[in-house]
Amino acid sequence: ELCDDDPPEIPHATFKAMAYKEGTMLNCECKRGFRRIKSGSLYMLCTGNSSHSSWDNQCQCTSSATRNTTKQVTPQPEEQKERKTTEMQSPMQPVDQASLPGHCREPPPWENEATERIYHFVVGQMVYYQCVQGYRALHRGPAESVCKMTHGKTRWTQPQLICTGEMETSQFPGEEKPQASPEGRPESETSCLVTTTDFQIQTEMAATMETSIFTTEYQ
């Protein structure tokens, strides 16, 4: 199930997925002056089985000598409703694929790719927040957001992060200072079904990752 909205926006912060759940889709977008090749992939799709996940399709861009068109009018069987967008950041540091079953790594850049990426996330996806350069993180709780399904609708949990305008960049994830005692998640879950997946795995994985996964510019 696709998430109906983007992850929450936090002033002076960016978010990043450490890995992408199966079903996630990434638009094949090209920078100005370029277009997808004829009959080229419209998007990449994270697919896999119990032992291995990878991105199906490859995005390819070519010069826009003619207008940006792609001929393909028959929906493919694997096409499914999807959703999400994120500002494009540098591909993350490599993650051991075995550490996060059912997830794909950040796709490598393709030639003449657009300067931002638009992802379409699925329920259970977790993203992590970091203050932009020049801002410092104050925490009330986890600096992360999870797409959950409640009462048949999707929503993102609210990350407990405030970025203050002090000229100091924080480490990520965890270890920001000053940091108040975590209060736990602010959402009070009701008695209806809540669908969450992989939270513990992703949190543990995040805690062991290098902190330099964000960059301010995409090369």
Partner: nanobody, 123 residues
């Protein structure tokens, strides 16, 4: 509440041009495609063109040489420039919004529809 409102339809002569517009409101459409479909009397609704937030486009074979889709993100509008119109282009033209990347979504699966605008091309 999402609303899609089409405008620009009308009666034109074969060979003429027409520009349809659709104003979208009620949510952020950054990760939605905006698209145009049409439905002629007695026929199924037909995909024409779609465009993403970053201007990636997709056209149906039947119109790709004559129709051009464009998008104005700050105004949440999408346009369909239709040139060299033919009598067989006569139909009700619908604006649509759908989650996900540019792709030819089958009409029953589209998330949001406008009410449609009539285009009639006389010979």
């Amino acid at each position: 509440q999402v609303q899609l409102v089409e405008s620009g339809g009308g009666l034109v002569q074969a060979g003429d041009s027409l520009r349809l517009s659709c104003a979208a409101s009620g949510r952020s459409f950054r990760n939605y495609i905006l698209a145009w479909y049409r439905q002629a009397p007695g026929k199924e609704r037909e995909f024409l063109a779609a465009i993403s937030w970053l201007d990636g486009t997709l056209y149906a074979d039947s119109v790709e040489d004559r129709f051009t889709i464009s998008r104005d993100n700050p105004k949440n509008t999408v346009h369909l420039q239709m040139d060299s119109l033919k009598p067989e282009d006569t139909a009700v033209y619908y604006c649509a919004a759908d989650r996900g990347p540019v792709r030819p979504v089958l009409a029953p699966d589209v998330d949001y529809w406008g009410q449609g605008t009539q285009v009639t091309v006389s010979s």
